[in-house]
């Protein structure tokens, strides 16, 4: 139960106080007592309910007839059952009794109010009052959790404006309420008692620029909606009538959590005595609603596909061809960013990141931003940010950043348990170096911080700075799979490559072609290259980064080997001995449910079958998935990239809901 | 082949900043390897910076690092050398030099390692 | 002080050769087969005439020639021509923490 005041009687005047229904009020009868008195007893009206304890051990009664010693061990507490209809109404009588004396009396008149501040704090997606019965200042993690919760009102609800809705203090129309949370001030008082009394709303300075909240006039419209609190307003004093009133407010938040905020906001109704207009208004009263705004959350490959995106670049027509027959099998949407655009930017993993933050009462797609800041640098504000579909950024957005910044670094894993650990939501993956060097690259801080900050998808570290992109999307992949864990890890494997070239070899096809059929690229006999001593060395160095990467994956996502499956891939190493992949990138593939998109590899044809599609297609078929091979030789490869580069997708969000888990 | 023609250098002050344009003609420079060299009055080449084709790596030689900034605009043909922080030392001659990365071996030559063209190059003269 | 040590000057009369050495460290020349070589004449840019130890771009005469043995590389330039006269500089990739190394640079005179 809440605590309300402490208040002191006194033998001399009646003392008037006011009891806001739901708390506990400690009642001081011993500090004025008359001083030959050894005892009391206390009456109250019907509405009141005394508490009498004295301790230790506690014996508690409730107030009768009963008379009890006077020292400093006996506690005296009030609570209201029903608010007043006029001030005063309710009345406690103390006598104070001595051996020698008659009884001396001491009144106390009582106006019970009902003030409640009421928030989703049971994560229903309805406000249900509470009766201050639960700790609204608390937010807890869990299925038995509680705490309200925010979203960030990042997406943009008015076409005509450039701005996420949260950058304005506006409240478009019910489409932009909807995006806040509801939060509720019940009052139920006297007539005349806000002629005495003020209520204010407040938030922590430290927290006022993080949120911002409107007052809703019931019955009207939502344009009537005015901001009372936000960030250059800390507190605001509220107009309530005297009488049984309910007041709306929506409340949005202006800021994800980071490193320097932890995304718990907090907004107090404080109960202020104004009657004495010759001193300070004093505080009786207050409660508070502790929401956490939503974090960011990524989708896993193994989340069902709703959009897929592509860029429209000089004679890649064949390839988006592919892409939008994979989407229709997919059932997807597809969306194509034209040349004008794109301004010959084709890399549409690396610009952004589609995730989704979600309340009770509304989920909403989000794209995060990177800060790479290339040819793509316009799409996601001007066309992927919009009506239900937020934007969030990080990172310098000039200068700063390395190759490790694009967001062909950054996956995440399909939900995992890890030595009994869950993590329903998966974990974060991104590419950093092994260790810090005067050129090693890394993930820029504020997006890791950020990352880490969302809480609940723990991020992992791998190492990808061997690679000349950097990309952990450049070795690694995850599918559906309908047994074990329900999702396979792909990993690029030269040491599968190799034992399947020379399986080759030794069938007699030591002469067929990588690269047949490709005009103006040298192509290379099966033999050749198994004797190539160099590329051998080359991939020997290779094998040992994506091993360490595949304990570090095994340890960190509680992966054993049969959960992992090696896709043939050479890779060859250019200047500074960084890795780049010698034929197109298989594991580099678009993943749309049971649909893959991989880049097709031109391997030796055997038999009038490419001996590595077959191979791939011998892992990958029997899980239920249905591999196409997209060419994407010219248009993608050979600029340093692959089908996965090229293509971003908005999945399914999370049936589970993030509030359910303990971080 | 590429032709390569360096701008933007010039007096300034110690402490202050330039950036360095090179800017490429005859061939797309998103297929080349790119480096700064330098060559104070009178003295010999000192290799400045490096970027790759792809724009997702770069080096730098330990008089510049933390000072000099080397990027690219694939889109504008042209690769940029911010220098800030300046000292009267860095007073050279500024050569913009490439290398080609569409290389066809099984194993690509360390064409990142020398330059195989390079531009007329422009005076950065730091003094007070 | 350079990385890479190249001799001052070397002087040749015309149809003669010469050899100008560049001698690194187990970290750069000695490690990589990444030497190259390169000419500049007075108020000119340098110009690549070896790469890879011993391999010539396009357009440079078979007179050039690069070699390599341990810590040293070599570049011998046969039947001295008038043009020959320049300034040649080798350069390595290092594991050090500047990866590119040039030398101090070599004055070639024809007599």
């Known amino acids: 139960m809440a605590q309300g005041t402490l208040i002191r009687v006194t033998p001399e005047q009646p003392t008037h106080a006011v009891c806001v229904l739901g708390t506990l009020t400690q009642l001081d009868i011993c500090s004025s007592a008359p001083e030959d008195c050894t005892s009391f007893s206390i009456n109250a009206s019907p509405g009141v309910v005394v508490d009498i304890a004295h301790g230790p051990p506690a014996k508690k009664k409730s107030t009768g007839s009963s008379t009890w010693p006077l020292d400093p061990g006996v506690e005296v507490t009030l609570t209201m059952k029903v608010a007043s209809g006029s001030t005063g109404d309710q009345k406690v009588q103390i006598s104070y009794y001595g051996p020698k004396t008659p009884p001396v009396k001491a009144l106390l008149y009582l106006t019970g109010v009902e003030i409640s501040l009421c928030a989703d704090i049971t994560r229903t997606g309805k406000v249900k009052p509470t009766r201050a019965v639960k700790d609204q200042r608390t937010w807890t993690w869990g299925p038995c959790g509680q705490g309200a919760i925010l979203l960030v009102n990042c997406d943009r609800d008015n076409l005509e404006s450039s701005a996420m809705d949260c950058e304005d203090d506006e409240v478009l129309d019910s489409e932009d309420l909807q995006d806040m949370s509801l939060m509720t001030l019940s009052t139920k008082t006297p007539k005349d008692f806000f002629t005495n009394h003020t209520l204010v709303l407040h938030v922590a300075r430290s927290e006022m620029d993080k949120v911002r909240v409107f007052q809703a006039t019931r019955g009207k419209l939502s344009s009537k909606c005015s901001v009372v609190l936000g960030p250059k307003w800390p507190s605001h004093y509220l107009m309530v009538p005297g009488g049984k009133h309910n007041m709306d407010f929506y409340v949005e938040a202006l800021a994800f959590p980071d490193t320097d905020f932890p995304g718990l906001i907090t907004l107090t109704i404080s109960l202020l005595d104004t009657s004495n207009l010759e001193l300070p208004e004093a505080v009786v009263f207050q409660d508070s609603v502790v929401f956490r705004v939503a974090p960011w959350i990524m989708t896993p490959n193994t989340q069902p596909p709703q959009e897929v995106y592509a860029c429209s670049i000089f004679e890649n027509e064949d390839f988006l061809k592919s892409v939008t027959t994979l989407a229709m099998k997919a059932k997807c949407k597809l969306t194509i960013c034209p040349e004008e655009e794109n301004m010959d930017d084709q890399w549409m993993q690396d610009e952004m990141e589609i995730g989704y933050i979600q309340a009770p009462h509304k989920t909403l797609p989000v794209v995060f931003d990177s800060p790479r800041n290339r040819g793509l640098k316009e799409f996601p504000i001007k066309r992927v940010m919009g009506p239900d579909f937020g934007y969030v950024t990080r990172g310098p957005q000039t200068g700063g950043i390395s190759g490790l910044d694009s967001f062909g670094n950054l996956e995440v894993s399909p939900p995992v348990t890890v030595r009994g650990k869950e993590y329903p939501l998966g974990r974060i993956l991104f590419g950093d170096s092994c260790y810090p060097s005067n050129d090693s690259r890394q993930m820029h801080q504020a997006l890791q911080d950020f990352l880490s900050a969302q809480q609940v998808q723990a991020p992992v570290k791998l190492y990808s700075d061997w690679l000349s992109v950097g990309h952990v999307d450049e070795f690694l992949s995850f599918v559906p799979a309908p047994d074990r864990k329900g999702f396979r890890l792909l990993l690029a494997s030269p040491r599968s490559c190799y034992k399947l070239f020379q399986e080759q070899q030794n069938e007699g096809h030591g002469e067929a072609l990588l690269f047949e059929g490709i005009k103006k690229k040298k192509q290379q006999k099966i033999k050749n290259i198994l004797s190539n001593k160099t590329l051998r060395e080359h991939n020997s160095f290779v094998e040992r980064c994506i091993d360490w990467n595949r304990e570090l994956l095994k340890r960190e996502l509680g992966l054993a080997e049969s959960d992992i499956i090696d896709i043939p891939q050479l890779f060859k190493l250019k200047e500074f001995s960084k890795a780049e992949a010698f034929f197109p990138n298989m594991v580099n593939m678009l993943v749309l449910g049971k649909h893959l998109g991989i880049p097709k590899p031109f391997g030796p044809v055997i038999n009038g079958r490419c001996c590595l599609e077959e191979k791939v297609c011998s892992l990958l078929e029997p899980l239920g998935l249905q591999c196409t091979f997209i060419n994407d030789f010219f248009t993608y490869h050979i600029r340093h990239g692959e089908v996965h580069c090229g293509t971003n997708v908005r999945r399914k969000p999370f049936s589970f809901k993030w509030w359910n888990m303990v971080p | 082949q590429v032709q390569l023609v360096e701008s933007g250098g010039g007096l300034v002050k110690p402490g202050g900043s330039l950036r360095l344009s090179c800017a490429a003609s005859?061939?797309?420079?998103?297929?080349?390897?790119v480096s700064w060299i330098r060559q104070a009055p009178g003295k010999g080449l000192e290799w400045v910076s490096f970027?790759?084709?792809?724009?997702?790596?770069?080096y730098y030689a330990d008089s510049v690092r933390g000072r000099f900034t080397i990027s690219r605009d694939n889109a504008k043909n042209s690769v940029y050398l911010q220098m800030n922080s300046l000292r009267a030392e860095d007073t050279a001659v500024y050569y913009c030099?490439?290398?080609?990365?569409?290389?066809?071996?099984?194993?690509?030559?360390?064409?990142?390692?020398?330059?195989?063209?390079w531009g007329r190059g422009t005076l950065v003269t730091v003094s007070s | 002080q350079s990385a890479l040590t190249q001799p001052r000057s070397v002087s040749g009369s015309p149809g003669q050769s010469v050899t100008i050495s560049c001698t690194g460290t187990?970290?750069?020349?000695?490690?990589?087969?990444?030497v190259s070589w390169y000419q500049q004449h007075p108020g000119k840019a340098p110009k690549l005439i070896i790469y890879?130890?011993?391999e010539r771009p396009s357009g440079v005469p078979d007179r050039f020639s690069g070699s390599k043995s341990g810590n040293t590389a070599s570049l011998t330039i046969s039947g001295l021509q008038a043009e020959d006269e320049a300034d040649y500089y080798c350069?390595?990739?290092?594991?050090?923490?500047?990866?590119?190394?040039f030398g101090g640079g070599t004055k070639l005179t024809v007599l």
């Open positions: 030099s490439s290398a080609n990365d569409d290389v066809d071996d099984i194993v690509a030559p360390g064409r990142g390692y020398y330059m195989d063209v």
């Open positions: 005859g061939s797309t420079l998103s297929d080349y390897f």
């Open positions: 970027i790759n084709s792809a724009n997702t790596f770069t």
């Open positions: 187990s970290g750069d020349v000695g490690r990589y087969n990444h």
């Open positions: 890879n130890v011993y």
């Open positions: 350069s390595s990739h290092s594991r050090s923490s500047t990866p590119v190394l």
